[in-house]
């Protein structure tokens, strides 16, 4: 579509729309954002029951009915067609394209690096505490405790591979059985899905974008939670994962392989190791009850060390501690023996920022946490902006069709499975499901990928991360090979089982429906997203952890009534939506409960009261930053700034606070034309699709 008005499709019957239409759909702010974005130009919607306005000059084909918010937005081409450009314009366009690609790759690189640093920051802040979770002896007997420990540790260290490697070393040291390790692995699977949910929060500025991004991210969460909900009881009852993996491990005579290939790390490590380097062994040592490790710092100081094995005379408490009777003696007071002692000589210090600061782990962690979140947020905003400007017109159409279109009949069902393979392959390449799903999130947000397509990609990502773990297990030393391989296979089969549960039959794709539901709620009440994050990844696991420590009777005593209420509510909800007539009139809706128990509106009012004072200053800051950004990017003056403020303005308008006087021309395209501003195609104008 051309960027300026064109005649055509004139309304055939003007009398139809001028006066008499009474069954008017209310205009929603969502719709205005989602459909047909031109130059990011958006104008606050004045909330009156207006009739749809038609013109003989059809500018934008806006449907009169409210669109499905889950439909992908039309990424409008606001640039000049390639054929209409002169040679200079074409060259400039090519250079702009290359520049954008370089910028995109650069921001993507720093995005991945910031995820790595974020993981390090979380480990510094909560790593030691996470390690102590593992040293709890009740894990052996309580699978539920194992599950929540898996969730909490992975959330605290922001790395499922760290928590899995701790489990592997504990199994190898016989501190943990494979049976007890399986729930922890399930928990780690849940915990790792928090990363892309955090990334989705960064897109909170635009409601419709946020709706899609948050749903796209939480589809991973729901898949993991639902899989655990079904498979943990099955595993506790049958031990099928333990049995199957044991058979596989015992049927092969594995030799130690080479290290699993570090593919993406090869590029990111040189940068991230200049920021901080961690001694990951410390968390494992704490988990294995090593008292000396509790006082060690996680920040690595010495990167080059020389380890020398030497025989040393050491004192022992009694003759029983002697390596052999002939290698034992006394000095008259103490008993001595000869032991092989590894003496570590420090040769060269690491080359990261914090090496000479000698700050406590918590301080370094908090500093890195703030910096990495800012970089993550900044990179994400820039990635979304660049993608938004690139993915317009024909480019967008091609990409969206390629990614979201199914194979022709009768092979349409295969498309999802190919997506699973693509997700697994991509995750194997980047060596991290967090990185892959986090990179996917903004693409879902801006509408390049549908949630229906993101779902199998995410499932594939879950498989990909387990294949990496299997490779890493095959490369592990002899003493840990069996246990690490069995645990990696448990992880693999757990994800396979989850896919079989929640993917093959379209009806069973509950995670999509649940994620969309949560996306809708979060788009309306954006605070609910953070609320969800805190409840599902912190409060519930910590509560279960606390109750488990109190013992089975307490856990059952509290858990059973809670589970009963949840089941009751779900059944009632199902009956209300499917066959309400079965229910008594009072139970056909939730109105019999206080409003705060069945609606988020009162909660929203309370939260708005607390956050209100921060909204306007934040908005002003946002607007200033945006204007600066617009100046740097050379955006048109009409560029609508700070989408995050739009809802605030709408809210104020609804309350009768005038935000800006209504203008004659709210549509920028019309206003420019009317004021004689429509210019001939200029080579300097924004370059987008070919």
């Amino acid at each position: 579509m051309a960027p300026w008005p064109e005649l055509g499709d004139a309304q055939p019957n003007p009398s139809k729309y001028l006066e008499g239409a009474t069954s008017q759909q209310p205009i929603t702010p969502d719709k205005s954002k989602e459909t047909n974005k031109t130059d990011n130009t958006e104008v606050p919607v004045t909330k009156f029951e207006l009739l749809p306005t038609y013109s003989t000059a059809t500018l934008i084909e806006e449907p009169t009915e409210v669109d499905d918010p889950w439909n992908l937005p039309t990424l409008q081409d606001s640039g000049i067609k390639w054929s209409e450009r002169d040679a200079k314009g074409k060259i400039l366009c090519v250079f702009q394209g290359i520049g954008r690609l370089i910028l995109l790759l650069g921001f993507l690189y720093f995005f991945v690096c910031s995820l790595d640093v974020l993981s390090s920051a979380f480990q510094l802040v909560g790593g030691k505490m996470a390690g102590q979770f593992f040293s709890n002896s009740s894990i052996m007997s309580n699978p539920l405790l194992g599950l929540v420990i898996g969730v909490l540790v992975t959330v605290f260290v922001q790395s499922s591979s760290t928590s899995t490697s701790i489990v592997v070393s504990m199994v190898a040291s016989s501190l943990l059985t494979v049976r007890a390790a399986i729930p922890i692995i399930m928990g780690a699977n849940i915990g790792t899905s928090i990363t892309n949910t955090i990334v989705a929060l960064m897109q909170v500025g635009d409601r419709s974008e946020f709706r899609r991004a948050f749903a796209g991210a939480t589809v991973h969460d729901f898949f993991n939670w639902l899989s655990v909900l079904v498979l943990l009881p099955v595993e506790v009852a049958t031990h099928y994962l333990e049995v199957v993996t044991q058979l596989i491990v015992e049927s092969f005579h594995f030799k130690n392989g080479e290290d699993a290939p570090d593919l993406l790390k090869v590029i990111t490590k040189p940068f991230t190791k200049l920021i901080v380097q961690l001694d990951k062994k410390v968390i494992s040592q704490i988990a294995m009850n090593d008292e000396t490790a509790k006082n060690k710092s996680l920040v690595k100081i010495w990167c080059k060390t020389f380890t020398n094995m030497t025989q040393m005379n050491v004192t022992v408490p009694s003759m029983a501690n002697c390596t052999s009777p002939s290698l034992c003696w006394t000095d008259g007071i103490q008993i001595w023996t000869m032991k092989n002692v590894t003496y570590k000589e420090n040769i060269a210090k690491c080359q990261h920022i914090f090496v000479n600061f000698h700050l406590p782990d918590l301080a370094v962690g908090i500093i890195l946490l703030i910096i990495s979140l800012l970089v993550l947020c900044g990179c994400l905003i820039m990635i979304v902006k660049i993608l938004g400007s690139v993915l317009k017109g024909q480019v967008a159409t091609v990409i969206k069709k390629t990614i979201n279109t199914d194979f022709p009949f009768p092979f349409a069902w295969l498309t999802g499975y190919l997506a699973i393979l693509v997700g697994a392959g991509m995750t194997f390449i980047v060596q991290s499901s967090s990185v892959f799903t986090s990179a996917l999130t903004p693409l879902i947000g801006i509408g390049v990928i549908t949630i229906e397509r993101a779902y199998p990609l995410t499932l594939g990502s879950n498989i990909g991360t387990t294949t990496t773990a299997i490779l890493a297990a095959l490369a592990s030393p002899g003493n840990t090979l069996r246990s690490s391989l069995q645990i990696a296979l448990c992880h693999f089969f757990f994800n396979i089982s989850g896919i079989l549960l929640w993917y093959p039959i379209p009806f069973t794709r509950l995670p999509i429906r649940m994620a969309k539901g949560l996306g809708n709620i979060s788009a309306k009440y954006r605070w609910f997203a953070i609320f969800y994050l805190i409840i599902f990844f912190f409060l519930i696991p910590l509560t279960v952890f606390g109750l488990s420590l109190a013992g089975w009777p307490v856990l059952v005593g509290v858990g059973v009534p809670v589970v009963f209420i949840i089941i009751l509510v779900l059944c009632l909800r199902l009956l209300q939506s499917r066959c309400p007539r079965v229910l008594p009139k009072k139970l056909q809706n939730w109105n019999f409960l206080p409003l705060c128990m069945h609606s988020l509106k009162p909660w929203d009012a309370v939260i708005s009261k607390f956050t209100g004072p921060f909204q306007m200053p934040c908005c002003c800051c946002c607007r200033v930053c945006c204007r600066v950004c617009c100046l740097l990017c050379g955006c048109p003056k009409c560029c609508r700034c700070s989408k995050c403020c739009q809802d605030l303005e709408e809210g104020q308008e609804a309350q009768g606070v005038p935000v800006k006087a209504p203008e004659t021309f709210d549509n920028i395209t019309i206003s420019r034309e009317a004021q004689g501003e429509v210019r001939a195609p200029d080579s300097k104008t924004e370059c987008t699709a070919l």
């Epitope: 005379n313 002939s326 007071i333």
Partner: antibody, heavy 119, light 107 residues
Framework: QVQLQQPGAELVKPGASVKMSCKTS????????MHWVKQTPGQGLEWIGA????????AYNQKFKGKATLTADKSSSTAYMQLSSLTSEASAVYYC????????????WGQGTSVIVSS | DIVMTQSHKFMSRSVGDRVRITCKAS??????VAWYQQKPGQSPKLLIY???TRHSGVPDRFTGSGSGTDFIFTISNVQSEDLADYFC?????????FGAGTKLELK
């Protein structure tokens, strides 16, 4: 050089006690054990016990437990052995000897104190 | 207690001769054995520790060997000043115990 000085002789009555000293010089007193050894013509060399002056830890031969008490004074770098309830069998030469660090060989010996129990 | 047995109470040798003094432990003591020389009217002097290690300042004609329960102390070229009592001592476990001693005399 390392030196251990002991008084030449002590004459004591049966049933009485004697406290003999071993003054050291030429090394750090608190780093090595101090052993006490009894020598009689009939019994040869017998180990009485040892003290670690660094923390006052002691070890005794079961045969001399209750009979000998080992102490050390860090300020004067002197080790002491008190023998109580003496009988004629206690008549012997008593040596203090410095233990080598980390094992029970004795590298430097005092000249010995000759104890004579006689009424 | 570990008993250290020196089978010869006396040994008679001429100057320049080679002498081997044996010592047997009642149980395995590894190599935790020391040898001392005591001249008449003097205090003992350490010659060998760890069964084979010569103490500083000890002439190399004095050597030690053995491990476990059987130990040998050798003077390869007997000198007149070597006339003395020789004791073995174990420090494998408390109480530390000494052998009865072997007296080296000149022929």
């Amino acid at each position: 050089q390392v030196q251990l000085q002991q008084p030449g002789a002590e004459l004591v009555k049966p049933g009485a006690s004697v406290k003999m000293s071993c003054k050291t010089s030429g090394y750090t007193f608190t780093t090595n054990n101090m052993h006490w050894v009894k020598q009689t013509p009939g019994q040869g060399l017998e180990w009485i016990g040892a003290i670690y002056p660094g923390n006052g830890a002691t070890a005794y031969n079961q045969k001399f437990k209750g009979k000998a008490t080992l102490t050390a004074d860090k300020s004067s770098s002197t080790a002491y052995m008190q023998l109580s309830s003496l009988t004629s069998e206690a008549s012997a030469v008593y040596y203090c000897a410095r233990g080598m660090y980390g094992h029970g060989a004795m590298d430097y010996w005092g000249q010995g104190t000759s104890v004579i129990v006689s009424s | 207690d570990i008993v250290m047995t020196q089978s010869h109470k006396f040994m008679s040798r001429s100057v320049g001769d080679r002498v081997r003094i044996t010592c047997k432990a009642s149980q395995d003591v590894g190599t935790a054995v020391a040898w001392y020389q005591q001249k008449p009217g003097q205090s003992p002097k350490l010659l060998i520790y760890w069964a084979t290690t010569r103490h500083s300042g000890v002439p190399d004609r004095f050597t030690g060997s053995g491990s476990g329960t059987d130990f040998i102390f050798t003077i390869s070229n007997v000198q007149s000043e070597d006339l003395a009592d020789y004791f073995c001592q174990q420090y494998s476990s408390n109480p530390l115990t000494f052998g009865a001693g072997t007296k080296l005399e000149l022929k």
